[in-house]
Interface confidence: low
């Protein structure tokens, strides 16, 4: 069964910077990745980035850089300009549309106890099928 993992990392050097890593584990290959925060895409979440294998990437503030890491994982750098970071308690969701499986989404957040530079372990938390 395909899985999506989400990993949220606070940068040790800049406490206002976060990186979201997402990956797809399963057969097939990826046709689109959507990253949102505050909830799943289309279910209360706000789009942060869309990555298309051929057409490229598009991102919205506070997303700073969205990029492919491997053929089945992406990363999204976030920069918080405010004094207090809203990211610490925020849920980030990644939805992978893949052929021929359909769409799979998973969400994750920075653990409350995280120290700078530490990351949440990859978490294939509840997977939502959204064909």
């Amino acid at each position: 069964t395909p899985e999506v993992w989400v990993q949220v990392q606070m940068e040790a050097t800049e406490l206002s910077s976060f990186t979201v890593h997402c990956g797809f584990l399963g057969p097939g290959s990826i046709s689109l990745v959507t990253v949102s925060w505050g909830g799943p895409d289309g279910a209360g979440g706000t789009k942060l980035a869309v990555l298309h294998p051929e057409l490229g990437t598009r991102q919205w503030a506070p997303a700073r850089q969205a990029r492919w890491e491997t053929q089945s994982s992406i990363s999204l750098a976030l920069e918080d300009s405010g004094a207090s970071s809203p990211f610490a308690n925020t849920t980030f969701c990644c939805k992978f549309a893949s052929f021929p499986e359909g769409s799979w989404e998973s969400c994750g957040s920075l653990p409350p106890s995280s120290d700078p530079g530490l990351s949440a372990p990859p978490t294939p938390v509840p997977i939502l099928r959204a064909d």
Partner: antibody
């Protein structure tokens, strides 16, 4: 430079097993998928399937489900094709081919191995 | 499975001529069509990706066109090193399929 180097020619009997290797160099192995393609003597090309070199998950074309297995040795940047219970019709040249990453359905083979000739004969 | 029909099966040309090779898909494949060259006893070489996108290191005399079901590979001013087999391949749906090939030979 980028290279895919395959193992040498094989002569096998029906019912035996063969394992063909494809060693990648010159790029990050886990960033690109690897496909396998069959070419029977004097014939065209037939896609056998591919393996995701990051997750290790293989996908097989219908005609290559059952006796065929793709595997990896990621630490050595090796991909393998194993064929069990060999049949005469398996006689062919087998190519490994690197897939351009992030193609919509993984399809563009930009670098190919030199091919491994397999002869199955009693 | 998507069937790719290449025509003609054989094309006899004189060096310096310009030629067009055809590849027709049995169903709509958008621009998910790639072209490869294969010389005798060698592995295939990617010439054009996604119907018309050029590949680094491939001479500019090779160009591709088409979309949907009909595609063309054009070789302008054919050189002796261009003779061999040419295959098209679709990646619109699994399994990936190749055309039967067009043999480009010296007249």
């Amino acid at each position: 430079q980028i290279q895919l180097v395959q193992s040498g020619p094989e002569l096998k009997k029906p019912g035996e097993t063969v394992k063909i290797s494809c060693k990648a160099s010159g790029y990050t192995f886990t960033t690109y998928g690897m496909s396998w393609v069959k070419q029977a003597p004097g014939k065209g090309l037939k896609w056998m399937g591919w393996i995701n070199t990051y997750s290790g998950v293989p996908t097989y074309a219908d005609d290559f489900k059952g006796r065929f297995a793709f595997s990896l040795e990621t630490s050595a940047s090796n991909a393998y094709l194993q064929i069990n219970n060999l049949k005469n019709e398996d006689t062919a040249t087998y190519f490994c081919a690197r897939e351009l990453p992030f193609t919509t359905i993984i399809g563009t083979k930009d670098y190919w191995g030199q091919g491994t000739t397999l002869t199955v004969s009693s | 499975d998507i069937v790719l029909i290449q025509s003609p099966a054989t094309l006899s040309v004189t060096p310096g001529d310009s030629v067009s090779l055809s590849c027709r898909a049995s169903q709509f494949i958008s621009n998910n069509l790639h072209w490869y060259q294969q010389k005798s006893h060698e592995s295939p070489r990617l010439l054009i990706k996604y119907a018309s996108q050029s590949i680094s290191g491939i001479p500019s005399r090779f160009s591709g066109g088409g979309s949907g079901t009909d595609f063309t590979l054009t070789v302008n001013s054919v050189e002796t090193e261009d003779f061999g087999m040419y295959f098209c391949q679709q990646s619109n749906s699994w399994p990936h399929t190749f055309g039967g090939g067009t043999k480009l030979e010296i007249k």
